[in-house]
């Protein structure tokens, strides 16, 4: 299996990729020899081999072409080679070696003549596994891989050299590379290719946010000498209208939206709304659907409710209780309220005018949350029309006509208003004479008055009622020197008015009469 080269390695030289002859310098010329061979994957390659194992004191050098350093500070040399076991070669015991030496020389130009003494030794290279001839039968080549570090390198380039001292070795491939922290995207921040320092220190790199994102915390990472990114700090987040998809911020697709910057995903447009384009921050409401100003973009678009239904009126003289049913269509919102429009009409329903401000609505006229209202202080024997509007948070945004249910009623005759003042005309030991004014609003012809009285100390546990035709009365059979409480109400054809307030009067202790005394409460 071909193992791909790590992405953090940048090749400066790879003999496998060179087309045709490598053309490296071999010194002396009968030492290292360039031949065609195959690598471990049977791919044809150019290799150098030497197998001068008969002679003592071999000193065969092979020098690469000049290798530019680029931005590298520390370089790595990867050698793949095959070393033949000396025991597998007849006649050569004592002269055959199983190591070779690796050298390098830095240089600013590439026309340098080969001189042994200018090279610095990197290491002696030995095989982890040499092979005997037996391995060749079915082409099992024991391929050794050795990697050595060199650095810091400062000049524009360098040469590598291989010194053979009597081994049977083939250089299958020579790869020289440096490590970089490769371009990467972390937390939606892009970090560029970065060449590490040769020393052990980490390089701090500032990231830049990917397209359509912004910094949440300034993104940073550290590039190690091994070409690895370490310790990500900070992050970017996708803008409104974009969501994180892999390493990018991708526009929300039509039909999806994202209202704010951050890590959230694009959401499907809420009901009755849509988007036609990529990257939407909110969704547009369909025709005749609306969203209130303070509604979040996640809220479904709605329309005004339909009219209330089944309005029932319950008239009691000059009051009416109105009840109705919830609209069939709420428009898709829960914030439905009801407004009552009151119109006072003539006998011709078309001739109406707004009701007097004196008319009272319980609990209120506008913004009702329940489906009932009591309207009081209407005029008796008068035609009224009540329009019950159903509204929700988007009603004011819509142009269609109001959604209301109307009911028309006629008030009955109203009972008279209360008697305001009771006056004591005369008292005796066992009688009191009282008089009073007709109510301010008799609301019809007063038929009679109901006079209710009881001893104060008995606290209304037992009381007496009598009727008076006019606006005065004498009450007899009372106890002397006793306080009595009196209440009077008028009656018309419409019924009794409400009682007056309570008035207190005392009978005399003896037989004389006292006249013209007002009451006290």
């Amino acid at each position: 299996e071909l193992s791909p080269q790590p992405s953090n390695e940048v090749n400066l030289l790879d003999s496998k990729t060179i087309q045709g002859e490598l053309g490296w310098i071999s010194y002396p010329s009968h030492g290292w020899e360039e031949i065609s061979g195959v690598d471990e994957h049977y791919t044809p390659i150019r290799t150098y081999q030497v197998c001068n194992v008969m002679d003592h004191s071999q000193n065969n050098w092979l020098r690469t072409n000049w290798v530019p350093r680029n931005s590298a500070q520390k370089i790595y040399v990867e050698l793949k080679f095959t070393l033949r076991d000396c025991n597998s070669i007849p006649l050569v015991l004592g002269t055959c070696k199983e190591t070779f030496n690796l050298y390098y020389m830095e240089s600013d130009d590439h026309g340098v003549k080969f001189r042994e003494h200018q090279f610095t030794k990197i290491d002696t290279i030995a095989a982890d596994e040499s092979f005997t001839q037996m391995d060749l039968g079915d082409r099992i080549l024991k391929l050794n891989t050795e990697i050595r570090e060199v650095g810091p390198v400062n000049k524009k380039g360098f040469y590598l050299a291989f010194q053979d001292v009597g081994a049977c070795v083939a250089l299958v491939s020579v790869r020289v590379y440096f490590k970089k922290c490769p371009f990467t995207v972390k937390n939606l921040a892009m970090f560029p290719d970065t060449v590490p320092m040769d020393s052990q220190s980490l390089v701090e790199v500032r990231g830049s946010c990917v397209n359509n994102s912004k910094e949440e915390d300034p993104p940073r990472m550290y590039c190690s000498t091994e070409g690895e990114w370490l310790v990500p700090i900070g992050k970017c987040t996708c803008n409104a209208g974009y969501e994180e998809r892999g390493f990018i911020c991708q526009a929300c697709r039509p039909g999806f939206y994202k209202a704010s910057d951050g890590a959230a995903k694009c959401a499907k447009c809420p009901p009755h709304s849509s988007t036609q384009e990529d990257g939407s921050m909110n969704c547009r409401c369909e025709n005749n659907y609306f969203r209130a100003e303070k509604d979040p973009p996640s809220m479904a678009c709605a329309r005004p409710p339909s009219a209330p239904r089944n309005v029932i009126s319950n008239i009691n003289e000059t009051s009416v209780i109105l009840d109705w049913s919830w609209p069939l269509d709420t428009g898709g919102r829960k914030d439905i309220t009801f407004n009552i429009i009151c119109k006072k009409c003539g006998w011709n329903v078309r001739q109406c005018e707004p009701c007097s401000p004196n008319v009272r609505f319980l609990p209120r006229q506008l913004g009702l949350t329940n489906t009932t209202v009591t309207v009081t202080d209407l005029l008796a024997h008068t035609n009224y029309t009540f329009e019950i509007d159903a509204v929700n948070g988007v009603s004011e945004l819509s142009s269609p006509p109001r959604q209301y249910a109307a009911v028309s009623i006629t008030t009955n005759q109203a009972a008279p208003s209360p008697v305001m003042t009771i006056k004591k005309d005369r008292t005796s030991r066992n009688s009191i004479s009282l008089s009073w004014q007709e109510p301010e609003h008799p609301n019809g012809i007063i038929l009679d008055y109901e006079v209710k009285y009881y001893q104060k100390q008995e606290q209304e546990t037992s009381y007496t009622i009598l009727r008076a035709r006019g606006t005065n009365v004498t009450i007899s059979s009372l106890k002397p020197d006793t306080t009595y409480v009196f209440q009077i109400r008028a009656r018309t054809a419409a019924g009794y008015g409400t009682n007056s307030r309570k008035f207190e009067f005392e009978t005399s202790p003896d037989s004389f009469s006292i006249s013209g005394e007002n009451s006290h409460v």
Epitope: R84, M134, L136
Partner: antibody, heavy 121, light 106 residues
Framework: QVQLLQSGAEVKKPGASVKVPCKAS????????MSWVRQAPGQGLEWMGW????????TYAQGFTGRFVFSLDTSVSTAYLQISSLKAEDTAVYYC??????????????WGQGTLVTVSS | EIVLTQSPATLSVSPGERATLSCRAS??????PAWYQQKPGQAPRLLIY???TRATGIPDRFSASGSGTDFTLTISRVEPEDFAVYYC????????FGQGTKVEIK
């Protein structure tokens, strides 16, 4: 250029001896072993053995021990094959061939032109 | 001693055709054989060694393959100069040759 130069044909009587030279040029003589190969008339190749040109240490193939001797004179880059007590069945072309050891395998990469030795009474 | 048997003894081919020569070892050998070409009146010439490495100057129409006991030399398109005798040779502590295959013009 690399070459191995052998002497011309030899005619010998049975029981006599012959010494066939093989002079190397164009490379360091002591850096490569030398092999000897026999080819009887109309027959195939027979490997006789080889000699380490560095140490002078010979190795003989089966059937080529006793009467056959490999030797060297490194001062003149020459290898020798000496056959004593010649027999009629020794009549053949004798080749010297330079041995090539490589990482991937061995072979004889440079051959002399051959010396015909005829044994006849 | 390992015996190498080559077949066929003679192979008749026309120029431009493919030629396949076989070399069988009497027992499994430790390494692929070397192959040699010999023309009449000339010394043998090394073609291939180390399983599949062509010797210097050998054209790429010559290739070798095989393992264990069965080995093959293939000439992909025979040229007029390729008519000759071909030998396989096993190497190790002791070397042996096959008896040869003659490639002749059909």
């Amino acid at each position: 250029q690399v070459q191995l130069l052998q002497s011309g044909a030899e005619v010998k009587k049975p029981g006599a001896s012959v010494k066939v030279p093989c002079k190397a040029s164009g490379y360091t003589f002591t850096s490569r072993a030398m092999s000897w190969v026999r080819q009887a008339p109309g027959q195939g190749l027979e490997w006789m053995g080889w000699i380490n040109t560095n140490t002078g240490n010979p190795t003989y193939a089966q059937g080529f021990t006793g009467r056959f001797v490999f030797s060297l004179d490194t001062s003149v880059s020459t290898a020798y094959l000496q056959i004593s007590s010649l027999k009629a069945e020794d009549t053949a072309v004798y080749y010297c061939a330079r041995v090539r050891f490589t990482v991937y395998g061995d072979g004889m990469d440079v051959w002399g032109q051959g010396t015909l030795v005829t044994v006849s009474s | 001693e390992i015996v190498l048997t080559q077949s066929p003894a003679t192979l008749s081919v026309s120029p431009g055709e493919r030629a396949t020569l076989s070399c069988r070892a009497s027992q499994s050998v430790s390494s692929n054989p070397a192959w040699y070409q010999q023309k009449p009146g000339q010394a043998p010439r090394l073609l291939i060694y180390g399983a599949s490495t062509r010797a210097t100057g050998i054209p790429d129409r010559f290739s070798a393959s095989g393992s264990g006991t069965d080995f093959t030399l293939t000439i992909s398109r025979v040229e007029p100069e390729d008519f000759a005798v071909y030998y396989c040779q096993q190497y190790g502590p002791s070397w042996t040759f096959g008896q040869g295959t003659k490639v002749e013009i059909k």
